[in-house]
Interface confidence: medium
């Protein structure tokens, strides 16, 4: 299916930036990894660069505005051509739904006192308002609560006095139109508007004052422009050649409105100076290389020694990392492609445990399905040797840290039955269904 | 642990309507999100529509939207799809599939078959000319 085919992807928003043209395959597109591309307008943009997970969503609002409530937040897999971790295709979302608590208690209505006595009327002549007051506070509201209804109520008031009336201009009337449309002619084009004191007239009784200024105001006509020339279109210029050594391009040619060039305010050419083509070099561009992530550390060894386990003697380990993706001559992942480091090997060495505190509560399980609950844990955390924490492996190569690597087995008092692990367990409340921010359907 | 059982399927001529019906077994049917799946013979199988636990969204393949509607029945344990407007190329068999509930969702997600954990043995339906 063609597929809209953009020169550039917003990490940052996820949208596909710099239109190069519609009608084109998923592939002759993503020819360039730079690229990313749209299946239609508005709908979901994917880069055209292998699949990795998007930066995680804000989280949603709270699903509540008082006491306890959930709230998701989701990231998206987007690229061509692969798969995220996890094995998911691009356009896949990934939820968490955690607990939350805009505000502790909910708000109480209160109720009003009585109403106050009236206020004067507003005005000294005529009809105006007055006004009368309650307080909110029989009783007062609480957490943020409020009492139904106004806090002071108006009716009308009348003075029994006439007002005078003053009066006031309706506003100008329209200009004559002038003798001429364009400069030239034997006289002075002159125009002239009028306005009237009606607006309101002045009152007789009791005596309002009557309009200040002029009832009509005359003025030359001037700036008349010549009269005009429409422009025209020059012939389409030759077409550019395609910009690009690789994947898709846009070429361009070019017209000139000089045919004629428009004179004395006459309309500019109708329509493009410019119009566009796609050119395909149907070359793939090059793809640099992306390092994996490190793989795990290998087991803490020293040469020559079976084993250095629970003993105060330094070994060392390593890791590695694969450089993948690199295509069509792009460039070798920078970097060191092994890691190694120092170490003490504690793996399953009996050591001494204490018991932590509470963890912070986990993210609520599973976000997507019915009933998810949270959890929290206090674990059995061993407590390490007081090896030293630098040692100097060869003269001359000064200090170098080290590490304790591998799993020991911690022993701690039992605690509520427990030897290693006393998890507690939550429901969440009020859960928002996973919905697609896009809503797109397939 | 889920089994699933489609029901519905049989010869019809085109234009006209049919309802498919999957019953799953298990108490915890309310919590799967559901899809229908169909394999022409000599094809490759292809989705057709899915719906997610709560019913909130419904996603349709472009060929029958328009045409088919999802439906779910938590208290019976079944889902539905009523296929009307048929048309020859729609004669498939039909396949109905179950997604434990995931970190995941969207319809490119529930379009994939590698997302369902449990699937039915299908029933046949044809359209004919």
């Known amino acids: 299916d063609p597929v809209l085919c953009f020169t550039q992807y917003e990490e940052s928003s996820g949208k596909c930036k710099g239109l190069l043209g519609g009608g084109v395959s998923v592939e002759d597109c993503c020819l360039n990894t730079a690229f990313a591309y749209q299946k239609r307008s508005g709908g979901l943009c994917q880069p055209c660069r292998s699949p990795r997970w998007s930066l995680w969503s804000t989280w949603a609002p709270c699903s509540v505005t008082c006491s306890e409530g959930s709230q998701l937040r989701y990231r998206r897999c987007v690229g061509w051509n692969g798969q995220c971790s996890g094995k998911v295709a691009p356009g896949t979302l990934e939820w968490q739904l955690q607990a939350c608590e805009d505000q502790q208690c909910c708000p109480e209505m209160g109720g009003w006192s009585g109403w106050g006595p009236w206020e004067p009327c507003s005005v000294t002549c005529s009809k105006g308002t007055r006004t009368r007051r309650r307080a909110c506070n029989h009783p007062a509201p609480k957490c943020g609560g409020h009492c139904p209804g106004q806090a002071q109520e108006s009716e009308a008031c009348d003075t029994q006095q006439v007002c005078p009336t003053h009066g006031a201009w309706a506003t100008w009337g329209p200009w004559t139109p002038c003798s001429a449309s364009c400069h030239g002619g034997p006289h002075e084009p002159k125009e002239t508007r009028s306005r009237k004191c009606s607006a309101p007239e002045p009152s007789q009784k009791p005596p309002g004052k009557p309009c200040p200024g002029l009832a009509y105001e005359q003025r030359r006509c001037t700036g008349l422009p010549p009269c005009p020339v429409a422009g025209g279109w020059g012939p389409w210029g030759p077409v550019s050649p395609c910009p690009v050594t690789c994947g898709l391009g846009q070429t361009m040619e070019q017209r000139t409105c000089n045919h004629p060039v428009p004179q004395h305010g006459g309309p500019f050419c109708a329509g493009d100076a410019t119009r566009t083509h796609i050119c395909n070099t149907a070359v793939p561009c090059p793809v640099d290389g992306e390092w994996d992530s490190w793989g795990e550390w290998s087991p803490c060894i020293r040469r020559n020694m079976k084993s250095i386990s629970c003993q105060e003697i330094p070994g060392q380990q390593s890791r590695g990392r694969t450089c993948r993706g690199r295509k069509f001559d792009g460039h070798r992942c920078a970097g060191q492609q092994q890691d190694i480091r120092h170490c003490y090997s504690i793996q399953h060495c009996p050591l001494k445990g204490s018991w932590s505190e509470w963890s912070t509560w986990g993210l609520c399980m599973p976000p997507c399905g019915p009933n998810p609950t949270r959890a929290r844990q206090r674990l059995c955390t061993p407590l390490l040797p007081k090896y030293p924490p630098t040692v100097s492996m060869v003269e001359g190569q000064g200090e170098k840290n080290v590490t304790f690597w591998g799993r020991p087995l911690p022993r701690c008092e039992e605690l509520q039955g427990q030897k290693l692990v006393v998890e507690e367990k939550r429901p969440c409340l009020h859960v928002p269904a996973c919905k697609d921010p896009e809503e797109e359907e397939l | 642990q889920v089994q699933l059982v489609e029901s519905g399927g049989g010869l019809v001529q085109a234009g006209g309507s049919l309802r498919l019906s999957c019953a799953a077994s298990?108490?915890?049917?309310?919590?799967?999100?559901m899809g229908w799946f169909r394999q022409a013979p000599g094809k490759e199988r292809e989705f057709v529509a899915a719906?997610?636990?709560?019913?909130?969204?419904?996603y349709y393949a472009d060929p029958v939207k328009g045409r088919f509607t999802i439906s779910r029945d938590n208290a019976k344990n079944t889902v539905y799809l009523q296929m009307s407007s048929l048309k020859p190329e729609d004669t498939a068999v039909y396949y109905c599939?179950?997604?434990?509930?995931?970190?995941?969702?969207?319809?490119?997600?529930?379009?994939?078959?590698?997302?369902?954990?449990?699937w039915g043995q299908g029933t046949q339906v044809t359209v004919s000319g």
């Open positions: 599939a179950a997604e434990e509930p995931s970190y995941y969702s969207g319809s490119y997600y529930y379009m994939m078959g590698d997302s369902y954990n449990y």
């Open positions: 298990g108490r915890t049917f309310s919590s799967y999100a």
């Open positions: 719906i997610t636990w709560r019913g909130a969204s419904t």
